[in-house]
Amino acid sequence: GSERTCCPVNWVEHERSCYWFSRSGKAWADADNYCRLEDAHLVVVTSWEEQKFVQHHIGPVNTWMGLHDQNGPWKWVDGTDYETGFKNWRPEQPDDWYGHGLGGGEDCAHFTDDGRWNDDVCQRPYRWVCETELDKASQEPPLL
C-alpha cells in the first residue's frame, strides 16, 4: 500500500492527523459511510487538546463523532478503548433518553453547542467530522 504523507485538499492537518469538517448534515450511519468512502473514520477524540482543536473548527453546532453504543457498550469506531480513554460528556450524559418520541433510545455521540458530548438519536441529520491518520499505510487489497 501507499502512505499518506500530507492531507488531501480541503482537509486540515493537526498532530499528524487530517480532519474534514462537513457543512451539511447526515444521520450518524451515513456520516460514518461518508468517512469510510474517504478512507477515513468519524473523529475519535483521544485528548483534551484534540477536543479543543475540533471544537474550535466546528463552532457551536451539533456534530457527530465516531462514538456509539448501538451494540451495547460505548465504542470508538477505530477500536480506541472507551473505558480508559478521554471523555467529555455533559453532566448526566449519556442518558439513553427515550422521551424524544422517535422510537428507541440514544445511541450515537455528538459534540453539543458548548463542545461537551451528548448521546442522541442516530437518525438526526447533524454535521460530522472525518479523521484519518498521516503515515498510515493504506490497506489496498490484492486483486484476485
Epitope: S2, K26, L37, P125
Partner: antibody, heavy 118, light 107 residues
C-alpha cells in the same frame, strides 16, 4: 484532460460472468472514490457500487450485492467491476464515475454495454 | 432506500422558455441533491450539486433551490443545446438514488 474509459462489455448468457474495466487518466486516481452507475435501455440511471480511494471500503446496491464485486488497481489507474450470476435485468450501459465531496459524480466515462441474453 | 420522484416526466418547450423541474425525496436529505443532464447516446453531465452550487463551466441559466424533501431545477432561458433528459440524485445515504428523469423536448 480528465478521462474515464470503460471496456469489457458484451453479450453474455444468464448465469454467466463478465469483468468491466475503467481506465482513468488526468487526475490522482488513488485519491478518489469511484463508482459504477448503470442505465438499462430506455430507462433511468441506477447506482451500482462505490469504492474508496485505497480500495479499503466498498458499497453496493441491494440488487447486485453478493453477485458483483468492485475493486481497483491504483498502480494501473484502473477500476473494475466483476459481475457474476448475471441476469437479464442486468442488461444496461455501465458507466464508471468519479466521486467528489457532496457524493456527486463529476466525471463519467462513455459507458460500456452489457447484454445478458440466451 | 430513499425514493426520488421527478415531475413532470416530460415537458415540451421552445427556445427562450423558462423550464422548471421538481424533485421530491421520500425522506429528508438536507441539501444532498444533485442535477445531471443527459443527451441521447451520451453520458450524464454534472450541472448542479449541493442543491444550488453550479458546477464549473456550466452556464448560469441553470439553477437549483430547495431543502429537505422538495427541490427545484430551473433553466431560465432554454437554449437549443438544452434539449435533453435531466436527472436529480440524492447523495444523502446509500444506496444513492436518482429520479426517473425529465425529458425536455422541442414544442
Amino acid at each position: 484532460e480528465v478521462q474515464l474509459l470503460e471496456s469489457g462489455g458484451g453479450l453474455v448468457q444468464p448465469g454467466g460472468s463478465l469483468r468491466l474495466s475503467c481506465a482513468a487518466s488526468g487526475f490522482t486516481f488513488s485519491s478518489c472514490a469511484m463508482n459504477w452507475v448503470r442505465q438499462a435501455p430506455g430507462k433511468g440511471l441506477e447506482w451500482v457500487s462505490a469504492i474508496s480511494g485505497s480500495g479499503g471500503s466498498s458499497f453496493y446496491a441491494d440488487s447486485v450485492k453478493g453477485r458483483f464485486t468492485i475493486s481497483r488497481d491504483n498502480s494501473k489507474n484502473t477500476l473494475y467491476l466483476q459481475m457474476n450470476s448475471l441476469r437479464a435485468e442486468d442488461t444496461a450501459v455501465y458507466y464508471c464515475a468519479k466521486r467528489t465531496p457532496y457524493d456527486v459524480f463529476d466525471i463519467w466515462g462513455q459507458g460500456t454495454m452489457v447484454t445478458v441474453s440466451s | 432506500d430513499i425514493q426520488m420522484t421527478q415531475s413532470p416526466s416530460s415537458v415540451s418547450a421552445s427556445v427562450g422558455d423558462r423550464v422548471t423541474i421538481t424533485c421530491r425525496a421520500s425522506q429528508g436529505i438536507t441539501s444532498w441533491l444533485t442535477w445531471y443532464q443527459q443527451r441521447p447516446g451520451k453520458a450524464p453531465k454534472l450541472l448542479i450539486y449541493d442543491t444550488s452550487s453550479l458546477q464549473s463551466g456550466v452556464p448560469s441559466r441553470f439553477s437549483g433551490s430547495g431543502s429537505g424533501t422538495d427541490f427545484i431545477f430551473t433553466i431560465s432561458s432554454l437554449q437549443p443545446e438544452d434539449f435533453a433528459t435531466y436527472y436529480c440524485q440524492q447523495g444523502n445515504s446509500f444506496p444513492f438514488t436518482f429520479g426517473q428523469g425529465t425529458k425536455v423536448d422541442i414544442k
